[in-house]
């Protein structure tokens, strides 16, 4: 069995250089501890953005350092990520483990796009 | 190392040059002349752990982030335990993309 | 995996299979090399993307059950064994590997 990973193609991010988008795992087994990690594709270079472990029915916490936040619902995870400039523009890959009860199973989503455009700066005012 | 059959064993992987507790870590082995067997692995901050049914009750997978060190205890080992053990890195992407040189466990009496 | 043993010429192509005895995601395969003495080395994962610094003469392709890696010329260096692993579920397994041999 496989797990299968959805999530959005394209997403924008906002003014303030915040995106958000839907993961959504299709769960071969019953897990109580899930695992997501956002990972950012660039080129060959793949790097961790990211990651939260939690128990089903419980609310994600990622490290107070974090640049993500998240909330969870079934087998629906809903991930922010701040603080993004121009040059954050990438593919955001979502990755999902079921880490328990075994066995493990691992999903990967086929990224999503996201595009950020720094806000022009405000012309000085006389 | 050469240690008797019922004896016991560590074996200890020291990693380098990523994020250590951002992977999964492997423990493979290879009998001498046969093909990779997987072990054990040992999940990000070591609360998760899965070994294969040959050696589950008998090996006990550990790590210290700190200092990046992946452990393998090993006890009442027998002769088929004999073989080279490797560590491995679980990529970001699931596949052991970088291994150690591997270490020559040798049980017998 | 097959077959056991390939015997090859340098420049000649190489073909090797590795079936799973059930389907599984594309997505989790992966190919390694071992050379005589060595630890393995990751060649392809996600059955057809190759690893960081792996020469363009390999390639993996397949799906469900039946995957291929193909080494389009061979290099003496190549000469090695091969194992198959699926990674996307517990127990990690492979293949029992295939030798490429020099005829």
């Known amino acids: 069995k496989a797990m299968h990973v959805a999530q959005p193609a394209v997403v924008l991010a906002n003014s303030r250089g915040t995106a958000s988008f839907v993961c959504e795992y299709a769960s071969p087994g019953k897990a109580t501890e899930v695992r997501v990690t956002v990972l950012r594709q660039a080129d060959s270079q793949v790097t961790e953005v990211c990651a939260a472990t939690y128990m089903m029915g419980n609310e994600l916490t990622f490290l107070d350092d974090s640049i993500c936040t998240g909330t969870s619902s079934g087998n629906q995870v809903n991930l922010t990520i701040q603080g993004l400039r121009a040059m954050d523009t990438g593919l955001y890959i979502c990755k999902v483990e079921l880490m328990y009860p075994p066995p493990y199973y691992m999903g990967i989503g086929n990224g999503t796009q996201i595009y950020v455009i720094d806000p022009e700066p405000c012309p000085d005012s006389d | 190392g050469v240690v008797q059959p019922g004896r016991s064993l560590r074996l200890s992987c020291v990693a380098s040059?990523?994020?250590?507790?951002?992977?999964?870590m492997h423990w493979v082995r290879q009998a001498p002349g046969k093909g990779l067997e997987w072990v054990a692995v040992?999940?990000?901050?070591?609360?998760?752990?899965y070994y294969a049914d040959s050696v589950k009750g008998r090996f006990t997978i550990s790590r210290d982030n700190s200092k990046n060190t992946l452990f393998l205890q090993m006890n009442s080992l027998r002769a088929e335990d004999t073989a080279v053990y490797y560590c491995?890195?679980?990529?970001?992407?699931?596949?052991?993309?970088?291994w150690g040189q591997g270490t020559l466990v040798t049980v017998s009496s | 995996q097959s077959p056991g043993t390939l015997s090859l010429s340098p420049g000649e192509r190489a073909t090797l299979s590795c079936r799973a005895s059930?389907?599984?995601?594309?997505?989790?395969l992966a190919w390694y090399q071992q050379r005589p003495g060595q630890a393995p080395r990751l060649l392809i994962y996600?059955?057809?993307s190759r690893a960081t610094g792996i020469p363009d003469r390999f390639s993996g392709s397949g799906s469900g059950t039946d995957f291929t890696l193909t080494i389009s010329r061979l290099e003496p260096e190549d000469f090695a064994v091969y194992y198959c692993?699926?990674?996307?579920?517990?127990?990690?397994?492979f293949g029992q590997g295939t030798k490429v041999e020099i005829k």
């Open positions: 491995a890195r679980g990529g970001h992407f699931g596949p052991f993309d970088y």
């Open positions: 692993q699926q990674y996307g579920t517990s127990p990690w397994t």
């Open positions: 059930q389907s599984i995601s594309s997505s989790f």
């Open positions: 996600g059955a057809s």
């Open positions: 040059g990523f994020t250590f507790s951002s992977h999964g």
């Open positions: 040992i999940w990000y901050d070591g609360r998760n752990k």
